[in-house]
């Protein structure tokens, strides 16, 4: 029951996490900037992985996509890649984990198969969460290290004077959503891996005994068939007699954990 709960909770936590990663990737507020209060209107600029938006004090908002790929910073491309890889791995992990859930019966799927699928999905969730955390952290690092921080400089071009506007970059909401979502996906993945251990069929803690009568005069001692129950005088599964009864390990060269009396 605890295994089912752990697996189910891991699935739900990962599902929420991946939904969060998708939301963060699509959000426009990765970085936010207040452009100086000019005489016409206060301008607020916020930028995401895919487009940039400008909001005026009147409430008017204009958003435009980054149509050129070549002009974009390599770091932004890396962040995009990390987030997409995180989403893809997470989505595949969710698909695998649905079939791995103990509460869902699909044909005659064995527990060992479900355990393997649970482990696979758990690893996928962990990698997905790490990708999201890495992506968000790379973007945040760019802001912290003033990678995009404008330095106040002037130069005269063909069309007159060009001045870089001094702006202060702050973390947008998408960064926090991404961190939390990545963390949840990571936690969900760990829970799935833990659940996998409980799902795996454990080794039988007794050796099955097969009896081969070698002659008519062989007498079976009481307790000979009680090895599997643990009752009776012969709980250690020792040979009861030498007249042909031997443990399965002595008969087969490749013992199996699924051998029963």
């Amino acid at each position: 029951m605890a295994v089912t709960a752990c697996q189910g909770l891991g699935f739900v936590v990962s599902l929420i996490g991946i939904a969060g990663i998708i939301a963060a990737t699509c959000m426009d507020q990765w970085s936010t900037q207040d452009l100086y209060n000019n005489p016409v209107t206060a301008v607020f600029n916020y930028q995401g992985l895919w487009r940039s938006c400008v909001r005026e004090s009147s409430g008017f908002t204009e958003c435009r996509g980054y149509f050129t790929l070549l002009g974009l910073p390599a770091m932004l491309q890396a962040v995009r890649a990390l987030m997409i890889v995180g989403i893809v791995l997470g989505a595949i992990g969710l698909l695998v984990s649905i079939f791995a859930l103990k509460c869902i019966r699909i044909g005659s799927m064995e527990d060992s198969a479900k355990a393997n699928m649970t482990l696979t999905s758990g690893i996928m969730f962990i990698v997905s969460g790490l990708c999201a955390i890495a992506g968000v952290s790379v973007f945040a690092n760019m802001l912290v290290t003033n990678f995009w921080m404008s330095t106040a400089n002037m130069y005269t071009g063909m069309g007159g004077m060009v001045q870089t506007v001094q702006t202060r970059y702050t973390f947008g909401a998408a960064l926090f959503v991404g961190w939390v979502a990545g963390g949840l996906t990571l936690i969900g993945g760990v829970m799935m891996c833990i659940a996998c251990r409980g799902l795996a069929p454990e080794e039988t803690n007794y050796k099955a005994v097969s009896y081969h009568a070698s002659g008519h005069s062989v007498a079976y001692k009481p307790g000979g068939f009680k090895a599997s129950t643990g009752f009776g005088s012969n709980t250690k599964n020792k040979k009861i007699y030498d007249g042909g009864a031997r443990t399965e390990d002595e008969v087969q060269s490749y013992p199996s954990k699924h051998d029963y009396v």
């Epitope: 900037q33 452009l35 016409v40 209107t41 600029n45 940039s52 400008v54 995009w148 001045q163």
Partner: nanobody, 120 residues
Framework: EVQVVESGGGLVQPGGSLRLSCAAS????????MSWYRQAPGKQRELVAG???????NYGDSVKGRFTISRDNAKNTVYLQMNSLKPEDTAAYYC??????????????WGQGTLVTVSS
């Protein structure tokens, strides 16, 4: 690189009209604000009029009711329609553009100016 080019200046009689144009080109993502400033000889540069992408306008006290600012967002162009011109409107008119040219790149670009002379 972002460039701003003004046009339309010239000599006009008092009471006359003139239309100035300013076009921005280059690596442009947004132009949140486009404005016109002027500087008369020996005086400080002052705001004539400004317009945002959303259509919010602001006029200098001395031109209210006489000048009209408009813009074409698709062409990244701003226009200044000047009516009932006075000799005190004589100045070099500069176009000022606030540009978001890329991710985290915010520029304030000034044109080289166009001369408007109001004289009989």
């Amino acid at each position: 690189e972002v460039q701003v080019v003004e046009s339309g200046g010239g000599l006009v009689q008092p009471g006359g009209s003139l239309r100035l144009s300013c076009a921005a080109s280059g690596s442009i993502l947004h132009i949140p604000v486009m404005s016109w400033y002027r500087q008369a000889p020996g005086k400080q540069r002052e705001l004539v009029a400004g317009i945002s992408t959303g259509g919010t306008t602001n006029y200098g006290d001395s031109v209210k009711g006489r000048f009209t600012i408009s813009r074409d967002n698709a062409k990244n162009t701003v226009y200044l329609q000047m009516n009932s011109l006075k000799p005190e409107d004589t100045a070099a008119y500069y176009c000022n553009v606030l540009v978001v040219s890329g991710i985290g790149s915010h520029l304030e670009v000034w044109g080289q100016g166009t001369l408007v002379t109001v004289s009989s």
